[in-house]
Interface confidence: medium
């Protein structure tokens, strides 16, 4: 019958205590888990990426620290704390090139843009989110490809030379055509003339073929080489820039 | 061609404290982290400590944290190593090495200093 | 800081393909593709051999390759020579900001 019986009040006063302390302590104890993309995030050489991470159950973070950092040594990617980014603790390389979008921080939701994406980005991330002394994390994965990945030196010059070898034949063509009309015609003038034929009087001379065949083929080859290579060099440029500072 | 050379090593009673240096050439030190190894006698490599490019980041073993301090000077392309309260088990050979990484192949060394070898003795 | 596991010694005979693995946890070799090996004889300082995972650098014979697989990662030797004779170390970026070797293994040219 006792169990049945009501609480005095000091055990009462306890039960509600001890449940209150449950409350309070649940709040810092780890009840969010931090959520990243499962699967790698894949950003061309100079656009901007973006990289999700949340906390589960959503709630509000604006009070949390909030951060990327990323290996080897936990180099600071981007840091948002006191409700204010921290600008000061980032690593070198990406001062200037991070943006926080916080339109959804009061549901446990943020965003890192990074801008002008490097081929030295690619690699491991780890956001992390902090509410007092707690702290859970997530680690992500960005790919970071060169927009002429598709493009080798041999398909790109395949794909420009092709149409221009195309019309160089036909024009060649054209004006083999021509020449040998023209041959005819002179051919026909000179016999009624009595004259004797050079054969060789009318050949193409060579540095003509060399001028009007070879050199328009081998023109735009080079250009599209010399092209091609700019366009590398100057998206490596970006990596090679800081290659050397691994920090 | 790249080249560490360093100094500084010598006995001393455990408590006591040394100064190791790495003196760097050949290469633009300003640009590159730098470690140290080391490696007691008859025993295998153990690293020590890094330092940023810009001497801004250091991070220690467990085992040195709170009593060696690593340090860089660019202006001199000088590696420092600051070693105090030393114990007996820091006697080793210790190397600068030069870490050649970056994001996305992790810390490495392609240059080691000749290495200088530590005594903590009494 | 515990070392990452490596056999204590491997040997072979000239002309054979030896291997040498490197086993840690997700924390360090599983976590990262950060695994280096150096290559080291008596008296002289560490060289490096392979960076990276399986990167070469540039001077050290392609008879030298590395690879990783879940936790453990390899070195492999081919066409074994008696100047490979020596210490091999593997190394690991380890989450929490720090650098771990194995704890060596001492290759003979039988």
């Known amino acids: 019958m006792a169990s049945l019986s009501r609480p005095s009040l000091p055990s009462c006063l306890c039960s509600f205590l001890l449940l209150l302390l449950l409350q309070v302590s649940s709040s810092y104890a780890g009840q969010f888990r931090v959520i990243g993309p499962r699967h790698p995030i894949r950003a061309l050489v100079g656009d901007e990426v973006e990289l999700p991470c949340r906390i589960s159950p959503g709630k509000n973070a604006t009070g949390m620290e909030v951060g990327w950092y990323r290996p080897p040594f936990s180099r600071v990617v981007h840091l948002y704390r006191n409700g204010k980014d921290q600008d000061g603790d980032q690593a070198p390389e990406y001062r200037g090139r991070t943006e926080l979008l916080k339109d959804a921080i009061g549901e446990g939701k943020v965003t890192l843009r990074i801008r002008n994406v490097r081929f030295s980005d690619e690699g491991g991330f780890t956001c992390f989110f902090r509410d007092h002394s707690y702290q859970e994390e997530a680690a992500m994965e960005l790919k970071v490809e060169d927009p002429f990945y598709w493009v080798s030196p041999g398909v790109l010059v395949l794909l420009a030379v092709l149409p221009v070898l195309l019309l160089q034949i036909t024009v060649g063509l054209i004006f083999l055509c021509l020449q040998y009309r023209l041959r005819g015609k002179l051919r026909a003038e000179i016999e009624n003339l009595h004259r004797t034929f050079d054969p060789h009087f009318l050949r193409v001379p060579c540095w003509k073929i060399t001028l009007f065949v070879i050199v328009p083929v081998l023109g735009p080859l080079v250009a599209l080489i010399i092209c091609y290579n700019w366009l590398h060099r100057r998206l490596a440029g970006q990596f090679l820039e800081e290659l050397r500072n691994p920090f | 061609q790249v080249q560490l050379v360093q100094s500084g090593g010598g006995v001393v009673q455990p408590g006591r404290s040394l100064r190791l240096s790495c003196a760097a050439s050949?290469?633009?030190?300003?640009?590159?982290?730098m470690h140290w190894v080391r490696q007691a006698p008859g025993k295998g490599l153990e690293w020590v400590a890094v330092?940023?490019?810009?001497?801004?980041?250091?991070y220690y073993a467990d085992s040195v944290k709170g009593r060696f301090t690593i340090s860089r000077d660019n202006s001199k392309n000088t590696l420092y190593l600051q070693m105090n309260s030393l114990r007996a088990e820091d006697t080793a050979v210790y190397y600068c090495?030069?870490?050649?990484?970056?994001?996305?192949?992790?810390?490495?060394?392609?240059?080691w200093g000749q290495g200088t070898l530590v005594t903590v003795s009494s | 800081q515990s070392a990452l596991t490596q056999p204590a010694s491997v040997s072979g005979s000239p002309g054979q393909s030896i291997t040498i693995s490197c086993t840690g946890t997700?924390?360090?070799?599983?976590?990262?593709?950060?695994v280096s090996w150096y290559q080291q004889h008596p008296g002289k300082a560490p060289k490096l051999m392979i960076y990276a995972v399986s990167e070469r650098p540039s001077g050290v014979s392609n008879r030298f390759s590395g690879s990783k697989s879940g936790n453990t990662a390899s070195l492999t030797i081919s066409g074994l020579q008696a100047e490979d004779e020596a210490d091999y170390y593997c190394s690991s970026y380890r989450s929490r900001d720090a650098l771990v070797f194995g704890g060596g293994t001492k290759l003979t040219v039988l």
């Open positions: 330092i940023s490019y810009d001497g801004s980041n250091k």
């Open positions: 050949g290469f633009t030190f300003s640009s590159y982290a």
């Open positions: 090495a030069r870490d050649a990484g970056g994001d996305s192949s992790g810390p490495y060394f392609d240059y």
């Open positions: 997700s924390s360090d070799v599983g976590g990262y593709n950060f």
